[in-house]
């Protein structure tokens, strides 16, 4: 009885489109195949940046793969050839892996990337990126900042800067259709007369970026005569109601603070005869419905009731 | 196999000029940076400056205006041309491999002795 | 500049025995940039470990690395004679990078 063996992928590579961290894994079919015509041959695929614990594995009949990377650091990657057991008349075969690596050739120390990069998607709606200049840089050093997302053609360059002593130090970008849902990359690269400036890379999806408008139409209702119920309004904007969660604030005569977090734009407040003035704000975030993480919007403005019983009417602003 | 080899070092007097090479194998200077460090005798370690991939170059810049970093990528070589030498610039000169922001080969080292 | 200042100069250590010297930065330094190497007389200086506590193909499991911000360490498990070296911190962050003067390890 022979062994059955069978050899690595050809041809194993990283390819880097451009996109700024969304690759390319690519390989050609092992030598000697004419053995297996009747077997569909799969790929065990394994790969990490370079510096992670973990390798993310995937199984494949293609000849490609692609996925997201952090370019800041290495890629490296690995494959082999599986020989179901239907073509072997018993176990699966293995072939040895074929290895491959990439990076970006950096250049610059890395105290000139840009330092601070901070982003934030305004009521889902408008992207902004901001960025402190690296240590040590010179005015003369002026950042510049690419982006793609699955949908796009290529990496597109910024074309409204935030500016600050004639430097970049931030992005102001374009409505940004079907971009949520997604990764969104991002480099900021630079140049300088005075010396080489390094890139940075970013990646995040724009849901988990929301920064929604405060709540509005801030109001009182009594419920009973020992219950208020607190309302208000979803701000405007495309963030659905069923998306957010809010935190509201409550002071009763100047003492007594009470913070709770709700899902709904209501909220039941006991209360005593004695209470003489009522004071709430409210803000806003995304909820786990609609993303993995957000930013808690501006307080609300105050809305307060003061001087009547509040037990002798309903309130409204 | 990786190596680096320096040469190109010796004697010269105060106020004269020497360039060093570094001949590269086994990677391409396309694709890694090349640093130059120096080690004064019984000393430590001193950065002089950087020869990136791209062909960009960063120095210490108390160095900067008497050293200048070139390469050929044809050769596969870096070079460190040295201007206007100083007793305080005898030291053992090395040429490194730049690889994930650390320097991971190192060559053996040529020595400058300044001095007349 | 980020100076790096190594602790003590000089030590020597038994056989068998626990080592641990110090680098401590002028300005915090990230821990992905820090980085140890190992010379000895005579040869040049080898990366050891690096990013603070990874360590260098081929260098033995009794060394480990430490540390944040300003403060880094390098420790020998059990001193073996082979260890006797120079180690060198280095900080690859800002510009100029800059080397600590170095710890002499010696075998007692």
């Known amino acids: 009885d022979t062994e059955i063996k069978v050899n690595p992928p050809q041809d194993f590579e990283i390819v880097d489109p451009g996109y700024l961290g969304y690759l390319y894994l690519q390989w050609q079919p092992p030598l000697s195949l004419d053995h297996f015509k009747e077997c569909t041959v799969e790929y065990e695929l394994k790969y990490r940046n370079i510096g992670s614990e973990t390798w993310k594995t995937i199984i494949t009949k293609n000849l490609h793969y692609k996925d997201g990377f952090d370019l800041n650091k290495g890629i490296e990657a690995k494959i082999h050839t599986l020989l179901p057991w239907q073509c072997t008349n018993g176990s699966e075969v293995q072939s040895s892996w074929a290895e491959t690596t990439y990076w970006i050739s950096p250049q610059g120390i890395p105290e000139t990337k840009v330092q601070d990069m901070d982003c934030v998607y305004y009521n889902w709606q408008y992207l902004l990126c901001s960025w402190k200049p690296g240590i040590g840089v010179l005015l003369d050093t002026n950042y510049n900042l690419f982006y793609w997302y699955e949908g796009l053609d290529h990496a597109l360059q910024c074309v409204d800067y935030i500016k600050a002593d004639g430097q970049n130090i931030g992005c102001r970008f374009p409505y940004l259709e079907a971009s949520d849902y997604k990764d969104f990359y991002i480099c900021v690269n630079g140049s300088s007369e005075n010396k080489p400036i390094r890139s940075s890379y970013f990646t995040f999806q724009l849901q988990n970026i929301v920064k929604p408008l405060p709540p509005v139409y801030l109001t009182f209702t009594r419920e009973s005569s020992c219950e208020i119920k607190l309302k208000w309004s979803i701000p405007l904007g495309p963030i659905p109601a069923r998306c957010f969660d809010y935190e509201i604030e409550i002071r009763e005569d100047d003492t007594t603070l009470v913070t709770a977090t709700v899902e709904n734009e209501t909220y039941t407040l006991k209360t005593t005869n004695e209470t003489r003035q009522l004071c709430f704000v409210v803000r806003s975030k995304v909820n786990i419905y609609c993303s993995d993480d957000g930013i808690w919007s501006e307080w609300s403005d105050k809305q307060c009731w003061e001087g009547e019983d509040l037990s002798k009417k309903t309130l409204l602003r | 196999e990786v190596q680096l080899v320096e040469s190109g070092g010796g004697l010269v007097q105060p106020g004269g000029s020497l360039r060093l090479s570094c001949a590269a194998s086994?990677?391409?200077?396309?694709?890694?940076?090349v640093h130059w460090v120096r080690q004064a005798p019984g000393k430590g370690l001193e950065w002089v400056g950087v020869?990136?991939?791209?062909?960009?170059?960063d120095y210490n810049s108390a160095l900067m205006s008497r050293f200048t970093i070139s390469k050929d990528n044809a050769k596969n070589s870096l070079y460190l041309q040295m201007n206007s030498l100083r007793a305080e610039d005898t030291a053992v000169y090395y040429c490194?491999?730049?690889?994930?922001?650390?320097?991971?080969?190192w060559g053996q080292g040529t020595l400058v002795t300044v001095s007349s | 500049q980020v100076v790096l200042t190594q602790s003590p100069a000089i030590m020597s250590a038994s056989p068998g025995e626990r080592v641990t010297m110090t680098c401590t930065a002028s300005l915090s330094v990230s821990s992905t940039y820090l980085h140890w190497y190992h010379q000895k007389p005579g040869s040049s200086p080898k990366l050891w470990i690096y990013?603070?506590?990874n360590l260098a193909s081929g260098v033995p499991a009794r060394f480990s690395g430490s540390g944040s911000g300003t403060s880094y360490s390098l420790t020998i498990s059990s001193m073996e004679a082979e260890d006797a070296a120079t180690y060198y911190c280095?900080?690859?962050?800002?510009?100029?990078?800059?080397f600590g003067s170095g710890t002499k390890l010696e075998l007692k």
């Open positions: 086994g990677f391409s200077l396309t694709k890694y940076g």
């Open positions: 490194a491999r730049d690889h994930r922001d650390a320097m991971d080969y």
């Open positions: 990013s603070t506590s």
């Open positions: 280095h900080q690859y962050h800002r510009s100029p990078l800059t």
């Open positions: 020869k990136w991939a791209g062909g960009s170059t």
